[in-house]
Interface confidence: medium
C-alpha cells in the first residue's frame, strides 16, 4: 500500500524537484566533458607561454564541474527513484548523500573565502597568459577569446603591469569596441576588476550558496518525512 | 644559419611603386614578429613598418601610412614590404629585421637583419 | 627630430671607458626596456644589448647596458679598434612603436 495525502504530495515534489536537479547535473556533465575534449576549450584550459603553464585552478576546475555534475546526476537519481518507488533504503541513501554534500559546501565556502585572494591571483595570472599568448603567437585564437571575455564581462581593458608592444596591441586589436581605450586601459585595470570581483561582489556568491544550502535542507526534510510516512504506511 | 635576404630594390621615378621581399632562411618566419626598418645613406636608423607572426597586428610609421603595405606569407618564408606613391624622401636602404620577444612581451629588440637593399626615388 | 637623444658622436682611445647615453621621457625610457645597436661602417646593424642590459650570444662582456629612470647608457669598456661604429639605442613605445635615437659615431684614437 503507498502513502496517501499530503505524504503523496511530498512524494511527488521529492520527484520533479530531483529529477530537475538530475537533469541540470546531466547538463553540468554534458558541458564539463564537451569542454574537456572540445579543442578550443583544451587549448585554453593549456594556454602555455613557453614553459609557463595557465594556473591549475582552471585545470582542476574541469574535474570539479564533472565531478559536481557526477554527484548531481547520482543524487537526483537516487531521490527521484527513491520516491517514485517509496523505497526508505534508497531515500536513506539519498539524505546521507544530502547530508554529505551540504558539508562540502560548507567546507568549501570556508575553503573559498579562506583563499579568495589565492584564487584572485590564479584568476589574473590566467588573464595575463592568455593575454601573452595573444600578442606573441596572434594565430591563438583561443587566448584572444579568453582576452575578449575577460574585457568584456568585466568591462576593464589591460592591467597595471603591461609593456608597450601589449599596450600597442591590445589599443588595435583587443580592447572593448566603442570604449575609449585610452581612459580603459589606465582606468579600468583589468587586475583591478577581478580583485574587486572577488571582495566585493562577494556577497553574491554567499547568496547562492544560502540559496543551495536552504534547498538541501528543504529535501532533507522532505526526504525524512517521506521515509516516515513510507514506514508508517508500511505498519498498516 | 638565420639569415634574412632582401630583394626588389632599385631606381624607381616619384609617384612609382616598388615591392620588397625578404626571405628568412635557418627560422620558421611564421613563429616572429618582423620589422622593417631603413636608413638614408650617411643618416640614422628608421622604422618603417612591424608585422605579427600571423599578420593579426600591424604597425606603420606616420610617414608611410597609407602608402607602404607590410604583408607576409608564412609557407613561403617571406615578408613583404608594397611601396607605392614613393617619394624623394623615401629614397633609402631597407633593411628587414627579426623581432625579439621576452617573457611578458617585452619588446627585446630586432636580433636578426638582412643586408639591406637599397631603393632610389628619383626623376 | 628622435625622441630619444644620443649624442652625435663620441671617442676614446684603446684600452678606455667609453659611456654612450641615450635619453628620453617618462613614456617610451622611463617606462620601457631599451635595446642597443652598433653597425660598422658598410654593414647592417646588429643587436648589441637587449631589454636594457643583456647581450646576446657572441656579444663580449666589454659591452653592457644599463639604464635608469628617463637615462639609458652603453658602456664600452678595453675600447678596441674595431669598436669603430654607429651606436644606436632603440625602444618600442605604445604609441609610435619602434623608435631608434639618432645614433652616436664612436671614434677610436690612436
Known amino acids: 500500500m503507498g502513502v496517501e495525502g499530503c505524504t503523496k504530495c511530498i512524494k511527488y515534489l521529492l520527484f520533479v524537484f530531483n529529477f530537475i536537479f538530475w537533469l541540470a547535473g546531466g547538463i553540468i556533465l554534458g558541458v564539463a566533458l564537451w569542454l574537456r575534449h572540445d579543442s578550443q576549450t583544451t587549448n585554453i584550459l593549456y594556454l602555455q607561454l613557453g614553459d609557463k603553464q595557465a594556473p591549475n585552478t582552471f585545470y582542476v576546475g574541469i574535474y570539479i564541474l564533472i565531478a559536481v555534475g557526477a554527484v548531481m546526476m547520482f543524487v537526483g537519481f537516487l531521490g527521484c527513484y527513491g520516491a517514485i518507488q517509496e523505497s526508505q533504503c534508497l531515500l536513506g541513501t539519498f539524505f546521507t548523500c544530502l547530508v554529505i554534500l551540504f558539508a562540502c559546501e560548507v567546507a568549501a565556502g570556508i575553503w573559498g573565502f579562506v583563499n579568495k585572494d589565492q584564487i584572485a591571483k590564479d584568476v589574473k595570472q590566467f588573464y595575463d597568459q592568455a593575454l601573452q599568448q595573444a600578442v606573441v603567437d596572434d594565430d591563438a585564437n583561443n587566448a584572444k577569446a579568453v582576452v575578449k571575455t575577460f574585457h568584456e564581462t568585466l568591462d576593464c581593458c589591460g592591467s597595471s603591469t603591461l609593456t608597450a608592444l601589449t599596450t600597442s596591441v591590445l589599443k588595435n586589436n583587443l580592447c572593448p569596441s566603442g570604449s575609449n581605450i585610452i581612459s580603459n586601459l589606465f582606468k579600468e585595470d583589468c587586475h583591478q576588476k577581478i580583485d574587486d570581483l572577488f571582495s566585493g561582489k562577494l556577497y553574491l556568491i554567499g547568496i547562492a550558496a544560502i540559496v543551495v544550502a536552504v534547498i538541501m535542507i528543504f529535501e532533507m526534510i522532505l526526504s525524512m518525512v517521506l521515509c516516515c510516512g513510507i514506514r508508517n504506511s508500511s505498519v498498516y | 644559419e638565420v639569415q634574412l635576404l632582401e630583394s626588389g630594390g632599385g631606381l624607381v621615378q616619384p609617384g612609382g611603386s616598388l615591392r620588397l621581399s625578404c626571405a628568412a632562411s635557418g627560422f620558421t618566419l611564421g613563429s616572429y614578429w618582423m620589422s622593417w626598418v631603413r636608413q638614408v645613406p650617411g643618416k640614422g636608423l628608421e622604422w618603417v613598418s612591424s608585422?605579427?607572426?600571423?599578420?593579426?597586428?600591424?604597425y606603420y610609421a606616420d610617414s608611410v601610412k597609407g602608402r607602404f603595405t607590410i604583408s607576409r606569407d608564412n609557407s613561403k618564408n617571406t615578408l613583404y614590404l608594397q611601396m607605392n606613391s614613393l617619394r624623394a624622401e623615401d629614397t633609402a636602404v631597407y633593411y628587414c629585421?627579426?623581432?625579439?620577444?621576452?617573457?611578458?612581451?617585452?619588446?627585446?629588440?630586432?636580433?636578426?637583419w638582412g643586408q639591406g637593399t637599397l631603393v632610389t626615388v628619383s626623376s | 627630430q628622435s625622441v630619444l637623444t644620443q649624442p652625435p658622436s663620441a671617442s676614446g682611445t684603446p684600452g678606455q671607458r667609453v659611456t654612450i647615453s641615450c635619453s628620453g621621457s617618462?613614456?617610451?625610457?622611463?617606462?620601457?626596456?631599451v635595446n642597443w645597436y652598433q653597425q660598422l661602417p658598410g654593414t647592417a646593424p646588429k643587436l648589441l644589448i637587449y631589454g636594457n642590459s643583456n647581450r646576446p650570444s657572441g656579444v663580449p662582456d666589454r659591452f653592457s647596458g644599463s639604464k635608469s629612470g628617463t637615462t639609458a647608457s652603453l658602456a664600452i669598456s678595453g675600447l678596441r679598434s674595431e669598436d669603430e661604429a654607429d651606436y644606436y639605442c632603440e625602444v618600442w613605445d605604445s604609441d609610435s612603436y619602434v623608435t631608434f635615437g639618432g645614433g652616436t659615431k664612436l671614434t677610436v684614437l690612436g
Open positions: 629585421a627579426r623581432q625579439r620577444i621576452g617573457d611578458l612581451v617585452v619588446h627585446y629588440g630586432l636580433d636578426v
Open positions: 608585422i605579427s607572426s600571423s599578420s593579426s597586428y600591424i
Open positions: 617618462s613614456s617610451n625610457l622611463g617606462s620601457n626596456t
